[in-house]
């Protein structure tokens, strides 16, 4: 709880925000968790704390570890944890998966690729953009503020895009790079009001207390790649990410499949170590697109162990 993964490359700037929500202007103390050593606030240090931000200028592989931040108030301190990993620079062009930020999708009508984490940095335009390590050139590519716009997107534009910018701290410049995948969606086809294939409406799923359980929300939205379509789970009307129960997680990313030419998505809800109180929750499978939203509700019931007779 209150933990966040952050990563960067050695000799680049890395800035991490305290995962625990506070408000601007509150005192935030940072510690290196393994030693409980306080992180200094003086900017002359290579690693220093600046309010809600922890700055590695530049980062070193040895900086990897868990950092604790405490948002201070006289009546209620709030603690968060930043799990920081600094990697060695790769000699080849390949960007490993562990350095990739979330994938974004684009289409002919919408082809913005945002540079991840850039809002944490003090940077000035223009951004430099690379695709598969090659600098992007030509009038089709426009670096605008913190994102890249590609005109007349084609299937060949799919790939890994890296943004590179300079962070300035008290007159000193530090390089930062961030990479994410871009996929191109086919505009042809049509979309329908979502059809949920599973679970059935008001389905009762039997689970065993103490065991793990999976619920799959699966829906189809039309033919071809869909501009806006999503399936997700809610608990008692609240998003899984906001519900705050670490045992209950949605599978990261949505699996896309084409069933009889239809575009379908599924999202798996994983419940670890099922507890009695999980049986009291309402599990909603939501499927939504531009046409609207459809909801199927599932409840859990206890599965009685089967008697084994000879």
């Amino acid at each position: 709880k209150f933990s966040k993964q952050s990563w960067g490359l050695e000799n680049e700037a890395l800035i991490v925000r305290c995962p625990r929500q506070g408000k601007p202007s509150y005192t935030v103390d940072w510690y290196y968790s393994q030693t409980n050593k306080s992180i200094p606030t003086q900017e002359r240090n290579r690693v220093f704390a600046s309010g809600q931000l922890l700055k590695f200028l530049p980062a070193a592989v040895a900086d990897s570890g868990i950092y604790t931040c405490i948002v201070r108030s006289p009546t209620f301190n709030r603690t968060g944890y930043a799990n920081v990993t600094i990697y060695k620079k790769q000699s080849d062009c390949n960007v490993p998966d562990y350095l990739m930020y979330s994938t974004v999708s684009g289409s002919e009508k919408n082809s913005k690729i945002y540079c991840p984490t850039i809002d944490l940095y003090n940077w000035t335009a223009p951004l430099e953009w690379f695709k598969n390590c090659q600098a992007l050139q030509g009038s089709r590519y426009r670096a605008h503020k913190s994102f890249l716009v590609i005109d007349n997107v084609m299937t060949e534009d799919a790939g890994d895009y890296t943004c590179k910018f300079i962070h300035n701290e008290n007159g000193a410049n530090y390089s930062v790079t961030a990479t994410r995948s871009f996929t191109v969606k086919d505009e042809q086809g049509f979309s329908l009001f979502p059809v949920i294939g599973a679970p059935a409406q008001n389905e009762i799923k039997e689970v065993e207390i103490g065991k793990n359980a999976n619920l799959t929300c699966s829906a189809c939205f039309g033919k071809g790649t869909q501009f806006l379509a999503a399936v997700l789970w809610q608990l008692n009307g609240t998003k899984i990410t906001d519900f705050g129960e670490p045992r209950i997680q949605q599978e990261e990313g949505q699996n896309q499949s084409f069933s009889n030419g239809l575009a379908c998505l599924d999202m798996v809800l994983r419940i670890a170590d099922v507890k009695e109180e999980d049986l009291l929750l309402q599990y909603d499978c939501l499927a939504l697109n531009l046409h609207g939203l459809r909801r199927h509700t599932v409840r859990l019931s206890r599965k009685n162990p089967i008697d084994h007779h000879s």
Partner: antibody, heavy 117, light 111 residues
Framework: QVQLQESGPGLVKPSQTLSLTCTVS?????????WNWIRQPPGKGLEWIGY???????TYNPSLKSRVTISRDTSKNQFSLKLSSVTAADTAVYYC??????????WGQGTLVTVSS | DIVLTQSPASLAVSPGQRATITCRAS??????????MHWYQQKPGQPPKLLIY???NLESGVPARFSGSGSGTDFTLTINPVEANDAANYYC?????????FGQGTKVEIK
């Protein structure tokens, strides 16, 4: 966006227990924050009653502590107020509110509770 | 308990003018470089709305016409320039220790 909604009886008899519930949407009460009850007698100022934080820990105003219980139902994403042995002085608009840190950031619309026989 | 005393109890201001409300605490609400004083606006029939936190920080979405200042025991909320829809009750609140307490309120009327 966090949204809060108070509910409960609008009329309570003297010496009985006042019970109110605050339903939270848009955020899980176990994720973070402190979840407060505040009251405001008609035409008067605000009085902080107490809170329950995301972990279930409670803190009460000492002036009401002997009569107050704040609890929660995580399965319904609700927290509740019970105030025992009420008198006419407990007539007020009761608000629930959330605290990110220190200040009351989001408020419910409030519900008027009248103590009368 | 820390007692917060607001003054004046009410004031009438013309649009475009400055309104100043003060809040005095019975003991200091400042520590470790911060002042744990917050200001709220309450219009009739509505819940209070946070305007200023930590004495001088404007809450997100609140117009820059509102500002706060002060430290220790003496704090000020300023509205400049006042607009017609600023007619409301204004409350200060501290969070220096438990219990949190509020001022008795200041009613701002627009002439």
């Amino acid at each position: 966006q966090v949204q809060l909604q108070e509910s409960g009886p609008g009329l309570v008899k003297p010496s009985q227990t006042l019970s109110l519930t605050c339903t939270v949407s848009g955020y899980s009460i176990t994720s973070d924050y402190a979840w407060n009850w505040i009251r405001q007698p008609p035409g008067k100022g605000l009085e902080w009653i107490g809170y329950i934080d995301y972990s279930g820990s409670t803190t009460y105003n000492p002036s009401l502590k002997s009569r107050v219980t704040i609890s929660r139902d995580t399965s319904k994403n609700q927290f509740s107020l019970k105030l025992s042995s009420v008198t006419a002085a407990d007539t007020a608009v009761y608000y629930c509110a959330s605290t990110v840190i220190d200040s009351m950031d989001y408020w419910g619309q409030g519900t008027l509770v009248t103590v009368s026989s | 308990d820390i007692v917060l005393t607001q003054s004046p109890a009410s004031l009438a201001v013309s649009p475009g003018q400055r309104a100043t409300i003060t809040c005095r605490a019975s003991k200091s609400v400042s520590t470790s470089g911060h002042s744990y004083m917050h200001w709220y606006q309450q219009k009739p029939g509505q819940p209070p709305k946070l305007l200023i936190y930590l004495a001088s920080n404007l809450e997100s979405g609140v117009p820059a016409r509102f500002s706060g200042s002060g430290s220790g025991t003496d704090f000020t909320l300023t509205i400049n320039p006042v607009e017609a829809n600023d007619a409301a009750n204004y409350y200060c609140q501290h969070s220096r220790e438990f219990p949190f307490t509020f001022g008795q309120g200041t009613k701002v009327e627009i002439k």
